[in-house]
């Protein structure tokens, strides 16, 4: 089995997590995709999902989560806006393929949200609704209730030994384990 890897993103309250999950275009383009959180000792919990069948480049907003599935590029974009400390955790993208188990996409995202000061350079996009100008989508195609019964095992972060080109955006602690994310004032 492929070893699950994770990327660590360290952000401040009010900022936006903006990530992508890639998938095999020919196989999963119109499949329903979901964003899940994995809590220690629990089964993954689905927080948001695309419509079924998934619509191309059509943003689906569930609370502070916005999903956009770019069929023609084989990419699911996930944004979590106005982050809160309690959003910290391990996340993953999955593709629903009933009756089979959901297909997990790499990488998993280890999100660490720390306290920030509103209105300072460490803060970002404090207003959820005005930021993206996306009319809230009432997701009629509800997310399937089942979750993967697999045992949740956490792999260590990938080696980032040769990572170069630092992008100076956020004060970081351990650069080898953390993805640097831009601060938008």
């Amino acid at each position: 089995a492929t070893k699950l890897t994770e990327e660590k993103y360290e952000l401040k309250e009010g900022q936006t997590l903006d990530v992508k999950c890639d998938y095999t275009l020919e196989k999963f383009a119109s499949s329903q995709k979901a964003w899940q959180i994995i809590r220690d000792g629990e089964m993954p919990k689905t927080l948001a999902c695309t419509e079924r069948p998934s619509k191309n480049s059509h943003p689906v907003q569930v609370g502070r989560i916005i999903l956009e599935d770019y069929h023609d590029h084989g990419l699911l974009r996930v944004r979590m806006v106005n982050l809160q400390v309690e959003d910290s955790g391990l996340y993953q993208c999955v593709i629903y393929q009933p009756p089979k188990e959901p297909h997990m996409l790499f990488d998993r995202i280890r999100l660490v949200v720390t306290k920030g000061f509103s209105g300072t350079p460490g803060s970002n996009e404090n207003s959820t609704q005005n930021v993206y100008k996306i009319p809230p989508t009432t997701t009629k195609a509800l997310c399937p209730l089942y979750t993967s019964p697999r045992t949740v095992t956490q792999a260590p972060p990938k080696s980032t030994a040769d990572v170069s080109t630092p992008d100076s955006e956020i004060n970081l602690t351990n650069v080898t384990d953390i993805i640097r994310v831009p601060v938008f004032n």
Epitope: K20, D22, Y23, T24, R77, S159, T160, D162, V163, P182
Partner: antibody
Framework: QVQLVQSGAEVKKPGASVKVSCKAS????????INWVRQATGQGLEWMGW????????GSVQKFRGRVTMTRDTSIHIAYMELSSLRSEDTAVYYC???????????????WGRGTLVTVSS | DIQMTQSPSSLSASVGDRVTITCQAS??????LNWYQQKPGKAPNLLIY???NLETGVPSRFSGSGSGTAFTFTISSLQPEDIATYYC?????????FGQGTRLEIK
Amino acid sequence: QVQLVQSGAEVKKPGASVKVSCKASGYTFTRYDINWVRQATGQGLEWMGWMNPQSGNSGSVQKFRGRVTMTRDTSIHIAYMELSSLRSEDTAVYYCARGGYTSSWRWYFDLWGRGTLVTVSS
Amino acid sequence: DIQMTQSPSSLSASVGDRVTITCQASQDIRKHLNWYQQKPGKAPNLLIYDAANLETGVPSRFSGSGSGTAFTFTISSLQPEDIATYYCQHYANLPITFGQGTRLEIK
């Protein structure tokens, strides 16, 4: 040394295919997307598509769909871009460029190959 | 697709001048904008990412600003080695598109 080294210039006939290689060194190849950008003589930059070297998944713009194939060999840190059914308007310099981390929506290209000139002529 | 319109398409300035190039997006791209410099016969080189962040190793005379649909790229004091074509590029959604370029010459 962090760099992308591309294969040499090619001359092809209309209808043929070309496969351009891009060898990465000095960084972890599987951690960053590889993008392909082309530039016709005296023209601007045109993004063709991307590839995640870790998963092997890729995507391209509608214009090239069905004609472009992006692959990689992780054991030797090489990305490939193959363009088929060549026509004269495909004559251009083809660049590979490193994108952001594979999981990040950061589409900036901070490292470029020198480019490969592909000439399509009968 | 989002269209990126740069202006002017070409300009001529003297060494020491302040040079400004603008990039207009056809829709709101927030700060998802990068600037590149391309010297004749060379590959492009990233100068500014996320609208205003200076890439490592790039001289501080280069700067960027803007948000939404209007962006500005500035060279505070033009140097002879700045002769090049400059491009903006958005990544607010896919496909990624570049501006048509601004060719900068020295008077």
